[in-house]
C-alpha cells in the first residue's frame, strides 16, 4: 500500500531512508536538458523474494537535443559538482547500510539523473531526520517518521526534532546538547 503523502517536513532539516521497503517506487527523473529514453521505464521498483530484494527496471536519460542516442554529454562545471554530490551521497548510503530483509538499498546513480530523487513510499517505511548544516538540534526526540495505516488511511508519524540557527544555547549548567544521529548521513530529501 502506497503512502498517500510525503513524509512531514521539518524546518531546517532533511530526511533520508536507510533502506526502502519492497513496493517503493523511485521516479526516473532526468536533469534539465535530458529526458527518459523512449523505451525506458518511468520508475524503478523495489521487489524481492524471501531472501533478496533489488530494484526492478533501470532509469536511463538521454539528451533532449539528441533524437535516438544515449550519447554522453559532458556536464558543465556546476552540473559536475551536483553530480559528484549525488554520487558521493549514494556511495555513502551504500557504505553505511546493512541489509534489511524485505528492503532495497539506495539505488546507484544513473547518467544525467535529476539532482533530487522522488520516492513513492509504502506503509511501514521509516525515514530519519537531521538538521541541515549550519543548524543544530534544539530538541531531539524521536527524529524519525513512520508511514502507518490507520482507519483505512495512511499517515506519517510526526518527528519530534526542532532545528535552530540560534547559536548560544540557554542550557542547564553542566548539561550537554544531545548527540545528533550519526553525522555525515546523506540527505536524500530536503524539506526547506
Amino acid at each position: 500500500e502506497l503512502c498517500d503523502d510525503d513524509p512531514p517536513k521539518i524546518t531546517h532539516a532533511t530526511f533520508k531512508a536507510v533502506a526502502y521497503k519492497e513496493g517503493t517506487m523511485l521516479n526516473c527523473e532526468c536533469k534539465r536538458g535530458f529526458r527518459r529514453i523512449k523505451s525506458g521505464s518511468p520508475y524503478m521498483l523495489c521487489t524481492g523474494n524471501s531472501s533478496h530484494s533489488s530494484w526492478d527496471n533501470q532509469c536511463q536519460c538521454t539528451s533532449s537535443a539528441a533524437r535516438n542516442t544515449t550519447k554522453q554529454v559532458t556536464p558543465q562545471p556546476e552540473e559536475q559538482k551536483e553530480r559528484k554530490t549525488t554520487e558521493m551521497q549514494s556511495q555513502m548510503q551504500l557504505a553505511d547500510q546493512v541489509s534489511l530483509p524485505g528492503h532495497c538499498r539506495e539505488p546507484p546513480p544513473w547518467e544525467n539523473e535529476a539532482t533530487e530523487r522522488i520516492y513513492h513510499f509504502v506503509v511501514g517505511q521509516t525515514v530519519y531526520y537531521q538538521c541541515v548544516q549550519g543548524y543544530r538540534a534544539l530538541h531531539r526526540g524521536p527524529a524519525e517518521s513512520v508511514c502507518k495505516m490507520t482507519h483505512g488511511k495512511t499517515r506519517w508519524t510526526q518527528p519530534q526534532l526542532i532545528c535552530t540557527g540560534e547559536t548560544e544555547p540557554s542550557q542547564f549548567p553542566g548539561e550537554e546538547e544531545p548527540q545528533a544521529s550519526p553525522d555525515g548521513l546523506p540527505e536524500s530529501e530536503t524539506s526547506r
Partner: antibody, heavy 115, light 107 residues
C-alpha cells in the same frame, strides 16, 4: 492517558515573580519539547518560547526575553515558566503545549496581577 | 515575524451547514500550519497539523487544505460540539505566531 497538569489560578502582587509548573504524564517526557503560550483578551494567543525537555536548551520569542524563563526538571517530568516583575499587563492564561505540533495542551493557569 | 491573518473574526452558521474558515500567512510557510479549536473556558485542541493531516480522534468532517500563504479549514455538516473559536498557527520558524481567531456561533 496523556496529560499536562497545571495549577488552575495564581493571584500575585505587581512587581513580584511567579513560577508556573506543567507536569507531563502518560508519555515519555523527554521525547517532546514543551512550548509555553499566553492568552489574553487583548492579544489572542502568543507564543512565549520552547524548551527542550531533554537538554534544557530554549528559544524565546524576543518579546518575552527578560520577562519569561523556561526550565525543566526531568526527574519529576515537569516544565516551568517563571515570569519576572509582574505587571497588570501580564494578567492572562498561560498554557504549556507539547511537541512540534502542540498536540496536547495543559488546562492553563490563570494569572491575575493585582494589588 | 510572520503574521497570520484570519480575516473573519466571527461567523454564524446553522447545524448541518458546511463552513470554511480561512487563514493567510504574510510569507510562504509551505505546509507548516496547524489548526486548533477552543471552546469557552477550555484549552485549545489540535485539529489539523501540517496543513492537512487530521489529528488523532478528530472527526472526518474536518479537513485542512492549502500551502504557501493561503490555508483553509472546512467543516462538513456542522455539529453542536463544533461551535467555538478556531485558530491557525505556523511552525515554520521561530517565533511561531497565531491568527487572531474565528469565532463560530450558532445562527
Amino acid at each position: 492517558q496523556i496529560q499536562l497538569q497545571q495549577p488552575g489560578a495564581e493571584l500575585v502582587r505587581p512587581g513580584v515573580s511567579l513560577k508556573i509548573s506543567c507536569k507531563g504524564s502518560g508519555y515519555t517526557f523527554t521525547d517532546y519539547a514543551m512550548h509555553w503560550v499566553r492568552q489574553s483578551h487583548a492579544k489572542s494567543l502568543e507564543w512565549i518560547g520552547v524548551i527542550s525537555t531533554y537538554s534544557g536548551d530554549a528559544i524565546y520569542n524576543q518579546k518575552f526575553k527578560g520577562k519569561a524563563t523556561m526550565t525543566v526538571d526531568k526527574s519529576s517530568s515537569t516544565a516551568y515558566l517563571e515570569l519576572a516583575r509582574l505587571t497588570s499587563d501580564d494578567s492572562a492564561i498561560y498554557y504549556c503545549a507539547r511537541g512540534v505540533t502542540f498536540d496536547y495542551w495543559g488546562q492553563g493557569t490563570t494569572v491575575t496581577v493585582s494589588s | 515575524d510572520i503574521q497570520m491573518t484570519q480575516t473573519t473574526s466571527s461567523l454564524s452558521a446553522s447545524l448541518g451547514d458546511r463552513v470554511t474558515i480561512t487563514c493567510r500567512a504574510s510569507q510562504d510557510i509551505s505546509n507548516y500550519l496547524e489548526w486548533y479549536q477552543q471552546k469557552q473556558g477550555k484549552s485549545p485542541q489540535l485539529l489539523v497539523y501540517n496543513a492537512k493531516t487530521l489529528a488523532e480522534g478528530v472527526p472526518s468532517r474536518f479537513s485542512g487544505s492549502g500551502s504557501g500563504t493561503q490555508f483553509s479549514l472546512k467543516i462538513n455538516s456542522l455539529q453542536p460540539e463544533d461551535f467555538g473559536s478556531y485558530y491557525c498557527q505556523h511552525h515554520y520558524d521561530t517565533p511561531y505566531t497565531f491568527g487572531g481567531g474565528t469565532k463560530l456561533e450558532i445562527k
